[in-house]
């Protein structure tokens, strides 16, 4: 999903909604007119603005991708909130797509965290309790390495 919010204003903006800019800015849910003299409302379900601003256009609402569920719809002051479907998650370093959660931990590890829309299952080493990092086989049954040798996706 693509989301583009306005930078929060550094100053306290007047709180009443009005049809003309206040201190050069328009309230959330509006953008400024091309002559800078009026505040124009965003179109519900089409675009939005989240902060006091002097943008000449509102920001386009995000459309949830297939594989995502819509948690809350786009309003004139808030973008659509999309979430990965059950059994999938979105990582911070690859936010463009939902990935399938692993169904189990590698041999010698135990699950300590469930699959959530924001994270894969979490596995730790049975003895040390340290987290596992890196790519791992999807389920325990696929591990074929002999006892004592580290699990490897290439073995």
């Amino acid at each position: 999903i693509t989301q583009q919010d306005l930078a929060p204003q550094q100053r306290a903006a007047p709180q009443q909604k009005r049809s003309s800019p206040s201190e050069g800015l328009c309230p959330p849910g509006h953008h400024i007119s091309e002559d800078g003299r009026d505040c124009i409302s965003c179109k519900y379900g089409q675009d939005y603005s989240t902060h006091w601003n002097d943008l000449l256009f509102c920001l386009r609402c995000t459309r949830c991708d297939s594989g995502e569920v819509e948690l809350s719809p786009c309003t004139t002051t808030r973008n659509t909130v999309c979430q990965c479907e059950e059994g999938t998650f979105r990582e911070e370093d690859s936010p463009e797509m939902c990935r399938k959660c692993r169904t189990g931990c590698p041999r010698g590890m135990v699950k300590v965290g469930d699959c959530t829309p924001w994270s894969d299952i979490e596995c730790v080493h049975k003895e040390s309790g340290t987290k596992h990092s890196g790519e791992v086989p999807a389920v325990e049954e696929t591990v074929t390495s002999s006892p004592g040798t580290p699990a490897s996706p290439c073995s």
Epitope: L6, P21, I32, E34, D35, N53, D54, L56, F57
Partner: antibody
Framework: VEESGGRLVTPGTPLTLTCTVS????????MIWVRQAPGEGLEYIGF?????SAYYASWAKGRFTISKTSTTVDLKMTSPTTEDTATYFC???????????WGPGTLVTVSS | DIVMTQTPASVSEPVGGTVTIKCQAS??????LSWYQQKPGQPPKRLIY???TLASGVPSRFKGSGSGTDFTLTIRDLECADAATYYC????????????FGGGTEVVVK
């Protein structure tokens, strides 16, 4: 649009540049300040809206203050350093049409 | 603040040739972008606004295009008088995002 007040100053000495306009009303337009160091590109400093609200580039906050009267717009350099040596331009800014009327610029040299 | 990335930094073309300058915004500005021409010792002159609208008195050899984050200034049938530095600047959200200019493109006409 015409700028004035540029001169040689020593570091740390506050300096105010003034932009005087004729032929249009400052109360109906936003005005922008831009500078250009010798041999360098244009650098946006900040602007002041028709209702006298001033906004600044993040690097310029605290270093400059923009204010206006009915016919002039002032740019105050609070504590100039040698890096502030540049030609300073004042211009009329319109929201959709950009910066359409520019002054010739005024040179500020900061040197000890 | 918004960041405007302009390429190339310099370009050299013969008289009669064509120059293309690109400007990329770090966030969408719709079509609210202006192009300026500056010659040594002079203030900038607005050439184009709203991405593609020619300012008064600017010859039609200058053409602006683009929207969102990617914009282009094309100068065709180059003349000696076109030798200058060209800058792009966003016009939407100046208080919200700032109005940083692109780094500039020096056009040399051979």
């Amino acid at each position: 649009v015409e700028e004035s007040g540029g001169r040689l100053v020593t570091p740390g000495t506050p300096l105010t540049l003034t932009c005087t306009v004729s032929g249009f009303s400052i109360s109906r337009y936003a005005m922008i300040w831009v500078r250009q160091a010798p041999g360098e590109g244009l650098e946006y400093i900040g602007f002041i809206t028709s209702d006298s609200s001033a906004y600044y580039a993040s690097w310029a906050k605290g270093r400059f203050t923009i204010s206006k009267t009915s016919t002039t717009v002032d740019l105050k350099m609070t504590s100039p350093t040698t890096e502030d040596t540049a030609t300073y331009f004042c211009a009329r800014y319109t929201y959709s049409d950009g910066t359409d009327l520019w002054g010739p610029g005024t040179l500020v040299t900061v040197s000890s | 603040d918004i960041v405007m990335t302009q390429t190339p930094a310099s370009v050299s073309e013969p008289v009669g040739g064509t120059v293309t300058i690109k400007c990329q915004a770090s966030q969408s500005i719709s079509t609210y972008l202006s192009w300026y021409q500056q010659k040594p010792g002079q203030p900038p002159k607005r050439l184009i606004y709203k991405a593609s609208t020619l300012a008064s008195g600017v010859p039609s050899r200058f053409k602006g295009s683009g929207s969102g984050t990617d914009f282009t200034l094309t100068i065709r049938d180059l003349e000696c008088a076109d030798a200058a530095t060209y800058y792009c600047q966003p016009n939407s959200g100046i208080a919200t995002y700032g109005a940083a200019f692109g780094g500039g493109t020096e056009v040399v006409v051979k």
